[in-house]
């Protein structure tokens, strides 16, 4: 009886099970009762990453420098090229089809997580006792200066954007 289902790495065609082509190869002709599936390796700059019956290989992704992209990992016959962004930029999506400049954290906010090629800067508000007085993609919130350890007193309270101002203690006469 002709099969209705086939084993793993096979496909059903013309009432018979044919072997799929291995990753890195494309289908030239289906199997017959006399011959196995005929497959051919993908060409230069092409790939197929699964067991398949595709008659055409996929083109490797192009990392367009005009979009801020560069090659992170060169493609093979079995894998696509992986793009990433130039320094200071990150991908706009998981597919990394274009890049945008890393976001800076405004004064009053510090960097919680520095941006990577695939993720943007994560900012956090500076909590009480910490400040950031610059717009930066790298700077964390800094702790207020401890006047006491310097044998000084707070002359002006700190904010999330400014450090405390220390001054000499008033001498009792």
């Amino acid at each position: 009886e002709p099969p209705t289902a086939c084993r793993e790495k096979q496909y059903l065609i013309n009432s018979q099970c044919c072997s799929l082509c291995q990753p890195g190869q494309k289908l030239v002709s289906d199997c017959t009762e006399f011959t196995e599936t005929e497959c051919l390796p993908c060409g230069e700059s092409e790939f197929l990453d699964t067991w398949n019956r595709e008659t055409h290989c996929h083109q490797h992704k192009y990392c367009d420098p005009n979009l801020g992209l560069r090659v992170q990992q060169k493609g093979t016959s079995e894998t696509d090229t992986i793009c990433t962004c130039e320094e200071g930029w990150h991908c706009t999506s998981e597919a990394c089809e274009s890049c945008v400049l890393h976001r800076s954290c405004s004064p009053g906010f510090g960097v919680k997580q520095i941006a990577t090629g695939v993720s943007d800067t994560i900012c956090e508000p500076c909590p009480v006792g910490f400040f950031s007085n610059v717009s930066s993609a790298f700077e964390k919130c800094h702790p207020w200066t401890s006047c006491e350890t310097k044998d000084l007193v707070v002359q002006q309270a700190g904010t999330n954007k400014t450090d405390v101002v220390c001054g000499p203690q008033d001498r009792l006469r």
Epitope: S29, T32, E33, F34, T35, E36, E38
Partner: antibody
Framework: EVQLVESGGGVVQPGRSLRLSCAAS????????MSWVRQAPGKGLEWVAS????????YYPDNVKGRCTISRDNSKNTLYLQMNSLRAEDTAVYYC??????????WGQGTLVTVSS | EIVLTQSPATLSLSPGERATLSCRAS??????LHWYQQKPGQSPRLLIN???QSISGIPARFSGSGSGTDFTLTISSLEPEDFAVYYC?????????FGQGTKVEIK
């Protein structure tokens, strides 16, 4: 027991035609692809033609394409090879074979075709 | 067309010896290769399919190996009835082709 019995061979003049038959028994004929393979005297094996189990698909090498026709009658459990415009180089023993697991798993005893004037 | 080249053309050995027959394909055929044996005056018979898979009823002394372009048929210890001609055949693509054969003869 699987049996393949060829017939129809003999001496024939160049340019003439001949039809070979292969009577199959011992298996469900209509479930198997079939082929013809030939062997010139003292030489190796050469594939001549194949036909799918249903008879819809036929396959030939370039050197016999257009001169040979493979066919089958599943109701009679018989395989045929029609050979036209015969040449001296067609002289050979012609074997009928069954395709099992993409191999020629059973062979007939062969029938000798001699093309000579 | 895929060309199969068998070597040696003739192998002269004594009963009990090990026989190693080679079949080389002109391009990769994965494991899509069969081996056949033909004794004088007889029809060929299937020995090995898919390069290394044994066939029911064939003695265990016959084994096949290889993949891609290089294949080997090994007869571990020759019996008198093993002296014959051996053919490889590819079924990777049309046209189906056979090697020219290796004759294993008694030394």
């Amino acid at each position: 027991e699987v049996q393949l019995v060829e017939s129809g061979g003999g001496v024939v003049q160049p340019g003439r035609s001949l039809r070979l038959s292969c009577a199959a028994s011992g298996f469900t004929f209509s479930n198997y692809g079939m082929s013809w393979v030939r062997q010139a005297p003292g030489k190796g094996l050469e594939w001549v033609a194949s036909i799918s189990s249903g008879g819809d698909d036929t396959y030939y090498p370039d050197n016999v394409k257009g001169r040979c026709t493979i066919s089958r009658d599943n109701s009679k459990n018989t395989l045929y090879l029609q050979m036209n415009s015969l040449r001296a180089e067609d002289t050979a023993v012609y074997y009928c074979t069954r395709a099992g697991g993409k191999a020629m798993d059973y062979w007939g005893q062969g029938t000798l075709v001699t093309v000579s004037s | 067309e895929i060309v199969l080249t068998q070597s040696p053309a003739t192998l002269s050995l004594s009963p009990g010896e090990r026989a190693t027959l080679s079949c080389r394909a002109s391009q990769s055929i994965r494991d899509n290769l069969h081996w056949y044996q033909q004794k004088p005056g007889q029809s060929p018979r299937l020995l090995i399919n898919y390069a290394s898979q044994s066939i029911s009823g064939i003695p265990a002394r016959f084994s096949g190996s290889g993949s891609g372009t290089d294949f080997t048929l090994t007869i571990s210890s020759l019996e008198p009835e093993d002296f014959a001609v051996y053919y490889c055949q590819q079924f990777n693509s049309w046209p189906l082709t056979f090697g020219q054969g290796t004759k294993v003869e008694i030394k």
